[in-house]
Interface confidence: medium
């Protein structure tokens, strides 16, 4: 038996974090995002659930909808109609997948002060939204789209093809929701509310993933989801636009797919309304290195949508896949013809380009060895975007304004010097034409949300500064967080190290690597967090490190596309390289190194444990992918190509966790998975376990019955983190 090692933060009245603190969410922070309803007005749900109206210019504020009205139908969300006559109240929230959920909706008439009776909405509804003007309602019920001209009117049924697990109208199927759209909806109103565009997904030929949901009954029920795994048949997509003024006169009109896309399997990737009669559709080949942006116009005389060839813009990657995680969307200028878009420049860095006629003639607006990340708003004279340019830290986000009215355009960093130590990672929320905006800072200090004048960038007021959190953290010993870079050969890897309080470089500490490492992800970010790993550093004296290896985002395509067609290689090698560098720093106990990850991170941690390097004593994989053949087509094929002999089958086979089963013999491995994981199917862990058993390798495992990919139910989450804590403490010989 080895003597147990207990970490005791010395001589300080402050207390260490406890696991209970983390599980109870004691130190969670708040953000404040205004729900803009005009250039200078917004709504916000108060702490006590009143919906409050604010006017920035008159300083007026009042309750537009009381918490008692909300409570009367157990509402948890709301939506104001643009004419401000009605509010929908959302209740009976029932989660489906990552973004999708069903709910019951009630319409409240603000003028009459009562709920709208007659022609009430069916339940449960899959999606509901107001038109951008007036108070038309579009909603999806049982996979079909319905329209109401006014909340009290009878509904008009727009589609009739909807069928559970077969045809989806206005809402995405599983794979489009998770891997392409990242929304629960697939319908978009034109700016004036005349047209409604929607997508129809036909999943009739897609193989079904089936798994048991145990519930409380005598027999488990089976969940069936059309889920295309790598190489399988994909959804067939069609885009339609319906005139909502006369929906019964003319049916939905299909928008043509560009010829170069339609010639083989393809995806629809996004829709952007440009003006009331112009729409922009983005398409992607199944081999996701070619994307086509197609601008289409309404032809009154044909009553059809026309997408001329000269309005097709092709974006192609020669080194990997098109776009970042998703292909970026265009931000159109006032002229409704030209647009701004982020894509790779000749040096492989993602930057803003201005496209007036053709992509070939695009004018590069930003440049440098950093990346533009998101375009928030384009107005007549300004373009607001975020980037990681400032001081060369890829894990920061600052907001910039380019004055496009000037010639040449001038650039200003809006956020770089506001609260330099506290705030290095921002997002923003703009009013319609950017007359005002809110800045939300996520760290590295305590998050703070502020309101600003869109012309002068002056701070108007603090919306949320997390004072209570600041006070409650006063007597807590938080670890020290460092963000630095290490060099290996010609490569630079950014890492975040979380060091125990009273860290002493002359002592030796156990090391836990937390890894995600998926393509186009980023773990090393300058954000505030008090979570499980914070606790492990604070209370248990464990050094935590997160490393962004090759394949991660915002450092150029050379770094990003290094993993193209060979997942599971460099992500793992770079973690190993980093561990070796950390050992060289002198304060790591080489005999107590562990790695853990969830999802893609579970895949990487498993491969790292099975690397045969002997670097790790133990590790944990939660809900890991174990073979890219088991995962969704859109994701797997984006990065790996097809699992066919003439494409990339060999690497699909080589990169499985199962192929390395014998290499787990000299590590302690804890494998964890939820049985109702709709995303990374339990099959992945079942196959790892089978391979380990066949290789006669001992390992530990835990399943969570009826839990999905997030293992997020309160009891399960508590059990999970408690279990992982015990495992780690045992591995590191830390006493309980």
């Amino acid at each position: 038996l080895r003597p147990s090692r207990v970490y005791k933060p010395e001589g300080n009245t402050k207390r260490a974090l406890t696991l209970k603190d983390i599980l109870n969410g004691t130190f969670s922070y708040k953000t404040y995002f205004p729900n803009w309803i005009s250039e200078q007005e917004y709504l916000h749900q108060s702490e006590d659930d009143n919906i409050v109206f604010y006017n920035i210019e008159t300083r007026e504020s009042y309750i537009i909808l009381s918490n008692s009205t909300m409570k009367s139908v157990n509402a948890t969300d709301y939506g104001l109609s643009p004419d401000r006559q009605f509010v929908y109240l959302e209740s009976d929230y029932s989660k489906l997948w990552r973004y999708s959920y069903t709910a019951t909706y009630y319409i409240y008439d603000l003028q009459n002060g009562e709920f709208v009776r007659g022609y009430e909405l069916p339940r449960p509804i899959q999606y509901l939204c107001w038109s951008p003007v007036g108070s038309k309602l579009a909603y999806v019920y049982q996979n079909n789209i319905y329209l109401k001209q006014r909340p009290g009117d009878p509904p008009f049924q727009i589609t009739y093809t909807g069928r559970e697990n077969r045809i989806f109208n206005g809402i995405p199927d599983w794979v489009y929701e998770e891997e392409m759209l990242a929304t629960k909806y697939a319908l978009w109103w034109s700016p004036d509310g005349k047209f409604l565009a929607y997508v129809e997904f036909n999943d009739s030929d897609i193989p079904i993933i089936a798994y048991s949901y145990y519930g409380d009954g005598q027999y488990p029920r089976t969940i069936n989801i059309p889920y295309p795994k790598a190489g399988a048949k994909n959804p067939v997509v069609r885009v339609f636009i319906v005139d909502t003024t006369y929906p019964h006169h003319v049916g939905p009109m299909e928008v043509p797919v560009p010829e170069m896309i339609a010639s083989s399997d393809y995806y629809f990737s996004w829709l952007t309304w440009v003006s009331s009669e112009r729409v922009c559709l983005q398409w992607l080949k199944r081999v996701q290195n070619v994307s086509v942006l197609s601008i289409c116009d309404f032809r009154e005389d044909w009553h059809a949508w026309e997408c001329p060839k000269n309005q097709e813009h092709v974006e192609e990657s020669r080194t990997g896949w098109a776009g970042g995680f998703f292909v970026s969307t265009p931000a159109f200028s006032q002229d409704a013809t030209s647009y701004y878009k982020i894509f790779s420049d000749k040096d492989g860095y993602k930057h803003i380009h201005y496209i007036k006629d053709t992509v070939e003639n695009a004018i590069q607006i930003t440049s440098g060895k950093w990346e533009a990340i998101y375009i928030f708003r384009v107005t007549q004279d300004s373009l607001f975007y975020s980037s990681n340019e400032f001081e060369g830290y890829p894990g920061r986000r600052n907001i910039y304004r380019i004055s496009i009215g000037n010639s040449p355009p001038s650039k200003k960093c809006v956020t770089c010097h506001l609260r330099k130590e506290r705030c290095q990672y921002y997002t923003a929320s703009f009013s319609y034409k950017a007359k005002y905006y809110a800045l939300v800072c996520y760290g590295p200090g305590l998050p703070i949300s502020t309101l600003h004048d869109g012309r002068t960038d002056q701070e108007i007021q603090v919306l949320e500064e997390n004072k209570e959190l600041e006070n409650s953290l006063r007597n807590i010993q938080l670890p020290k967080v460092e963000i630095k870079k290490l060099k290996d050969g010609g490569l630079t890897f950014w890492y975040k190290m979380i060091l125990p309080p009273q860290f002493d470089r002359s002592k030796k500490y156990p090391l836990l690597i937390q890894v995600y490492g998926g393509p186009c992800s980023q773990s090393v970010k300058s954000v505030f967090a008090v979570n499980w790993i914070t606790y492990l550093a604070s209370k248990e004296g464990i050094v935590i490190a997160l490393v962004d290896g090759r394949g991660t985002a915002f450092q150029g395509d050379k770094f990003l596309h290094a993993v193209y067609r060979k997942l599971g290689v460099y992500e793992v090698e770079d973690q190993l390289t980093a561990v070796r560098k950390f050992i060289e720093m002198g304060f790591i106990d080489e005999e107590r190194i562990a790695i853990w990850g969830w999802s893609y991170g579970g895949y990487v941690s498993s491969l790292a444990l099975a690397s045969g390097t002997g670097l790790f004593k133990c590790g944990i994989a939660v809900a890991p992918v174990s073979s890219w053949e088991y995962y969704a087509s859109i994701y797997s094929e984006r990065f790996m190509g097809l699992p066919t002999k003439d494409d990339n089958l060999e690497h699909y086979k080589n990169s499985t966790v199962m192929a390395r089963a014998e290499y787990f013999r000299n590590v302690d491995y804890l494998l964890i998975h939820g049985t109702a994981d709709d995303n990374v199917h339990f099959q992945n862990s079942a196959q790892i376990a089978k391979a380990l058993v066949n290789a006669q390798v001992d390992f530990q495992a835990m399943w969570y019955s009826d839990q999905n990919h997030g293992i997020s139910s309160g009891r399960s989450q508590n059990h999970l983190y408690t279990h992982m804590t015990h495992f780690l403490k045992q591995c590191f010989s830390l006493s309980d």
Epitope: Y570, L576, S611
Partner: antibody, heavy 116, light 108 residues
């Protein structure tokens, strides 16, 4: 049964080149770190080079850096050592070995003689 | 680089006797990173011990490893005729991996 079979050794003049191969069987080759270790006649063991499972990371002893190149073909379960600008002091039996920290399996070795 | 010094250079013993071989590192080496090998004339080396004290597959229990920091020991509790060979220690904590110069165990 794990087997490592080296080939490609022989007599070569100073400044010349040789390519050694090591055919692996009996274990899953693609994730395994592999190394070359040499032993001059009547002398001890000297580590020469190592390569990660994917081939993405390579490591060399200072004495061979810039002259030797380690590579692998996972589809053929084969490890290679390309030796250029050979010198008399490179004369040795070259072993291919599985591993990086501890070399748990070794080939029988192939003799490389550099002499004019 | 980390230099490993083995002693004695040669050990003359009879079958049945206990052999104690020493390996000293020029700087501290974590146990995880130390291995021992046996090599007989005309043969490739064979892994005996890894992680300073763990026996490799198929190695008889008369072979044991111990030590930490800079001093490591390989012990053969009762020498068998087939144990007469050259023994090398090896570290892989420092880059590059290095071997000791070897200890020859010969029949007295």
């Amino acid at each position: 049964e794990v087997q490592l079979l080296e080939s490609g050794g022989g007599l070569v003049q100073p400044g010349g080149s040789l390519r050694l191969s090591c055919a692996a069987s009996g274990f899953t080759f693609s994730p395994a770190y592999m190394s070359w270790v040499r032993q001059a006649p009547g002398k001890g063991l000297e580590w020469v080079s190592a390569i990660s499972g994917s081939g993405g990371s390579t490591y060399y002893a200072d004495s061979v850096k810039g002259r030797f190149t380690i590579s692998r073909d996972n589809s053929k379960n084969t490890l290679y050592l390309q030796m250029n600008s050979l010198r008399a002091e490179d004369t040795a039996v070259y072993y291919c070995a599985k591993g990086w920290r501890a070399f748990d399996y070794w080939g029988q070795g192939t003799l490389v003689t550099v002499s004019s | 680089e980390i230099v490993l010094t083995q002693s004695p250079g040669t050990l003359s013993l009879s079958p049945g006797e206990r052999a104690t071989l020493s390996c000293r590192a020029s700087q501290s080496v974590s146990r995880n990173y130390l291995a021992w090998y046996q090599q007989k004339p005309g043969q490739a080396p064979r892994l005996l011990i890894y992680g300073a004290s763990s026996r490799a597959t198929g190695i008889p229990d008369r072979f044991s490893g111990s030590g930490s920091g800079t001093d490591f020991t390989l012990t053969i509790s009762r020498l068998e005729p087939e144990d007469f060979a050259v023994y090398y220690c090896q570290q892989s904590l420092g880059y590059p991996p290095t071997f000791g110069q070897g200890t020859k165990v010969e029949i007295k």
